[in-house]
Structures are given as C-alpha cells and as structure tokens.
C-alpha cells in the first residue's frame, strides 16, 4: 500500500492530527521535499545577519553578514569581521600575511615586498605585514661624495605569483 | 617543475564508471587549498565538478555530480582522482585536474592557478 | 548558479579595445571572488585576472578586470595578434557549501 502522506508535496506535510492530509506549513516554517511529517522552522537572520532570501513554504531563508562582515562556514554559518590591514581573506577566514608580504588594506591579498634591489636601490624603511618596504637612493648615492641624496621613489605594484 | 598530469582510459562504456587520476609533481599536498576537477565537452564551455580540500579531505561537489561523482585524494603517491558513475555519451569531455590558488599563508583563495593539459575521455559502447 | 557572459563571441582587429562581460546570478564570496581566465584551442585554460582586478603574474598590462558583486567586465585595451582565443570568467561562491562556476565563454576571433 502506498504510504498516502507520499502525495504531500513541498510547502506542506502530512498531518496525523488530520487523518494524514496534505496540511500547508504553518507561518515562519517551510517543507523543501515532499512527503514530510512536519515543516522546519525558518532560520532567522538576526543581529550581524541580514536576511538575502526569505524563507518561503518551501525553502529555508538564506542569510549573509552585515557590512563589515564576510560570511564563512556552510550556509553562512557564521559572520567574521572583514580583516584587517595585514591580513587577507581566505576560505579559512582571515588569515595574516606571510613574512615578506604585506596588504595595507582591510580588502585584497597580500603582496610581496617590493625588492629595491631590482630598481638598483637599497632598503630606507623594512616592509611589515602591513606596509610595503620604502626604498631608498641606491648605495652608490650613499657613498661619500655623493652631492644629493635622491627622495625615495614610489613602490611599484609587486606581481603576485601564487605558488 | 610545477605540474598537473591527468591520466585514466580514453574510452569509457555508458553505464560504467569514469576513473582518472591527477598526479602531482613540484609540490605537495601540506597545505588548505582544494584539488579539482573541471570539463569541458567539445566545441562546449567549461563545466566545474567538484574539489577536495587536501588540509582535511572536505569534498565539494557540483549540483549535477551529487550522487554520481567521488574525488578522493592519496597524499602517499602525490594524486588526487575522479571517480564518475553510471557515464552517458553527454559526459564526453577533457577533464582537467587543476590547483586552487593559495595564500601566502597557505590557504585557498578561490580561483585556479594551475592546471593539467586535459584527457579526454569517450563515453561510447 | 548561472553565469552569462556576453557577448558569446566577437570579432575584432588588432589594436581594438574589446570589453567582455559577466552577470552572476547570485553574488560571488566576498563580493570579488571573481576570476578570468584565457583558453586557446587544445590548450588548458590560463589565469589571467584574479579578486576581480588583480593581474596574473606574467600576464600584460592590457588586460584589465572590474567590478563587484554580481557583474564583472574584462577589458583588452588594444588586442594583440595573441589575443584570439575564448575567454572565460569564474566565480567562488559559499552558499551551503563552497561552490564554484563557470561562464558560458567568449571567443574573440579576427575580423
């Protein structure tokens, strides 16, 4: 014999309060498959949640974070703080930036340092996680003799090379 | 040299299973990005199957691969594989294995930054 | 999830300014996670722009990414003869789970 609460479909459930009759889910609650024997409460989106769907008789509402949050863990799970200046956004959350890079930016990736060396220059001021290096006049202007001391040049964009 | 090799038959019979493997050389997986598998059918785009995330073996899997697609991962040999059931003549395809990017930190950053030539596979009897 | 790009295909000369889009159906994680990606015949699929507007390693200076959220442009300032080939955009998104797609492809071809 066929089960009769199989004829129940999504949005309702099977009541056996009722002589097992296809029942509409109540307010606030949704059934996503048929042939259910109750409904599920909706999830609510409250504090540092905001609601991106809203639940319907037949699916779960859906939530993402407040600005100045990012969603992580399965469905939004949970809301982290956007990350810091020297930090970057993985699928692990945030994380801080490796020895040798920096992001001073509470978006983006790290970067690495630029190297001063490349431009024929020496280190003025050491990178941090959260700053790139300065780079300075280049070690021949630092000998004695030398009339003028150049102003630090800008720092390149560094290439990223994910590896 | 950093590389991704697919390997695996050519030539499959509908209704069996799909089997290829991704072996990895230049590094190794010590880190918490994803391994993945994408397709692509001729003359078609590309279509992602599914990843495994090599820190703690998490799989993720396309909506239409559920049920019909396991990805497992063997850190002893370096490789991760693709296993596809009950294959139709619409699962002809190069299938690509390809790396997730990783921070400098080591973590997954979402986007693929490494991939494999391509095998491609023939599903017919 | 659906990512459309458009236009499917285009052609175009050398030294032309060629912009490519890509509309998500949902917003990717972050609001960036959006990568674009070049795909010649035969050939596996290449990193070209990643978080939406940031270049590949090695990749010129031409090529140029923007936008957030759910709609993303990939720009070619002045095509080069190298140029021609299909490409693609691709989207991390965290819904019950980590999911990832990819767009229906342009292919640039000479005109």
């Known amino acids: 014999l066929q089960d009769p609460c199989s004829n129940c479909p999504a949005g309702t459930f099977c009541d056996n309060n009722r002589n097992q009759i296809c029942s509409p889910c109540p307010p606030n609650s949704f059934s996503s498959a048929g042939g259910q024997r109750t409904c599920d409460i909706c999830r609510q989106c409250k504090g540092v949640f905001r609601t991106r769907k809203e639940c319907s008789s037949t699916s779960n509402a859906e939530c993402d974070c407040t600005p100045g949050f990012h969603c992580l863990g399965a469905g939004c799970s949970m809301c982290e703080q956007d990350c810091k200046q020297g930090q970057e956004l993985t699928k692990k959350g945030c994380k801080d930036c490796c020895f040798g890079t920096f992001n001073d930016q509470k978006r983006g990736i790290c970067r690495p340092w630029t190297n001063c060396s490349l431009d024929g220059k020496s280190v003025l001021v050491n990178g941090t996680k959260e700053r790139d290096v300065v780079c300075g006049p280049s070690p021949a202007d630092l000998s004695p003799g030398a009339s003028s001391v150049t102003p630090p040049a800008p720092a390149r964009e560094p290439g990223h090379s994910p590896q | 040299q950093v590389q991704l090799q697919e390997s695996g038959p050519g030539l499959v019979k509908p209704s069996e299973t799909l089997s290829l493997t991704c072996k990895v050389s230049?590094?190794?997986?010590?880190?918490?990005?994803?391994m993945c598998w994408i397709r692509q059918p001729p003359g078609k785009g590309l279509e992602w199957i599914g990843c495994?995330?090599?820190?703690?073996?998490?799989?993720y899997y396309a909506s239409w691969a559920k049920g019909r697609v396991t990805i497992s991962v063997d850190s002893s040999k370096n490789q991760f594989s693709l296993k596809l059931s009950s294959v139709t003549a619409a699962d002809t395809a190069v299938y690509y294995c390809?790396?997730?990017?990783?921070?400098?930190?080591?973590?997954?950053?979402?986007?693929?930054?490494?991939w494999g030539q391509g095998t491609l596979v023939t599903v017919s009897s | 999830i659906q990512m459309t790009q458009s236009p499917s295909s285009l052609s175009a000369s050398v030294g032309d300014r060629v912009t490519i889009t890509c509309q998500s159906s949902?917003?990717?994680?972050?609001?960036?996670?959006l990568a674009w990606y070049q795909q010649k015949p035969g050939k596996a699929p290449k990193l070209l722009i990643y978080?939406?507007?940031n270049l590949a390693s090695g990749v010129p200076s031409r090529f140029s990414g923007s936008g957030s959220g759910t709609d993303f442009t990939l720009t070619i300032s002045s095509l080069q003869p190298e140029d021609f080939a299909t490409y693609y955009c691709?989207?991390?998104?965290?819904?019950?789970?980590?999911?990832?797609?990819f767009g229906t492809g342009t292919k640039v071809t000479v005109l």
């Open positions: 230049g590094f190794s997986f010590n880190n918490d990005y994803d």
């Open positions: 978080r939406a507007s």
């Open positions: 691709q989207g991390t998104y965290l819904s019950s789970n980590w999911y990832w797609a």
């Open positions: 495994i995330d090599t820190g703690d073996g998490s799989t």
């Open positions: 390809a790396r997730e990017a990783a921070s400098s930190s080591g973590y997954g950053m979402g986007y693929f930054d490494l």
């Open positions: 949902q917003s990717v994680y972050d609001n960036n996670w």
